[in-house]
Amino acid sequence: GITIPRNPGCPNSEDKNFPRTVMVNLNIHNRNTNTNPKRSSDYYNRSTSPWNLHRNEDPERYPSVIWEAKCRHLGCINADGNVDYHMNSVPIQQEILVLRREPPHCPNSFRLEKILVSVGCTCVTPIVHHVA
Amino acid sequence: GITIPRNPGCPNSEDKNFPRTVMVNLNIHNRNTNTNPKRSSDYYNRSTSPWNLHRNEDPERYPSVIWEAKCRHLGCINADGNVDYHMNSVPIQQEILVLRREPPHCPNSFRLEKILVSVGCTCVTPIVHHVA
């Protein structure tokens, strides 16, 4: 990998080994300055593989609210507006990092956690494997 | 919101105000124990709105590698396997949290950052607004 010289102005850290504890500033910097907050919010209705959004709330997690997509149909919407069951609506999943309060209920101590979330749905050609 | 009693075993924190600095254990806990590592990895080819995945690497960010989806076509693949340009392939975007080294090049000091990533593509019916 790329070796970067350590900045002499870095805060001290007692534990240099993994699992390592680091200092994190929770004042979020948002790099999405050039995007409309509406973003992809209407795709869930306009897509040929539409989905519903479900609110997942967990006060022990940061962010505490995550929206999960659930495909509306097994098939995909065709040109006539009907569901075509020769195609499949499937969720696009992504692994994201969240902060989990550890020990529980502590406001200033977290552990990184990887969770899988469904972001939206896409229409795919089904693959069938003959097993016998 | 939900008020949770503070755990008496929590680490001390000097700064109780935002922007607040918290302790984060980087030993990632993966809750996706029951998922296939392949997950949606082949959807990018099988979708009616296929996409390519581009590697975005930044050593000052954690995670340092993020994969970005770029739709292959302006239109969507129809039942005949041709691209239908009356429909649109569009990227499904999601805001995710990452850690940004701050000050730069420091191994143990980070700031939370929100970035927008394209996770995959979906096929939508275009909407046209007449502006004049």
Partner: nanobody, 122 residues
Framework: EVQLVESGGGLVQPGGSLRLSCAAS????????MYWVRQAPGKGLEWISA????????YYADSVNGRFTISRDNAENLLYLQMNSLKSEDTAVYYC???????????????GGQGTQVTVSS
């Protein structure tokens, strides 16, 4: 107020060339994806080309790929479509459109609606 005004169409023989222009105003042109859309007689709108805000990322319909080139001048708020090796099936009204949302492609568009007629005939 968003305004998109197309020009440059006309009658051309098969194999000929045309350069379409679109003058944009009323929005921050350099922040939006821009598109060329065409409508052949009796057909629906067909998205034939798209160009990212910075100009580095372009899309083309298979039917025009290799013959048409989309470009933009962000300083002058102009979008172009260079059309070479024109065919009779390219006959249509050509419209310039902008994405409805800033920054990326959403499949939602604003267009001026006047268009410029391109007729390819011998």
């Amino acid at each position: 107020e968003v305004q998109l005004v197309e020009s440059g169409g006309g009658l051309v023989q098969p194999g000929g060339s045309l350069r379409l222009s679109c003058a944009a105003s009323g929005f921050t042109f350099s922040s939006y994806w821009m598109y060329w859309v065409r409508q052949a007689p009796g057909k629906g709108l067909e998205w034939i080309s798209a160009l990212a805000p910075g100009g580095g990322n372009a899309y083309y319909a298979d039917s025009v790929n290799g013959r048409f080139t989309i470009s933009r001048d962000n300083a002058e708020n102009l979008l172009y479509l260079q059309m070479n090796s024109l065919k009779s099936e390219d006959t249509a009204v050509y419209y310039c459109a902008k994405d409805h949302n800033v920054g990326y492609r959403t499949g939602e568009y604003d267009y001026g609606g006047q268009g410029t007629q391109v007729t390819v005939s011998s």
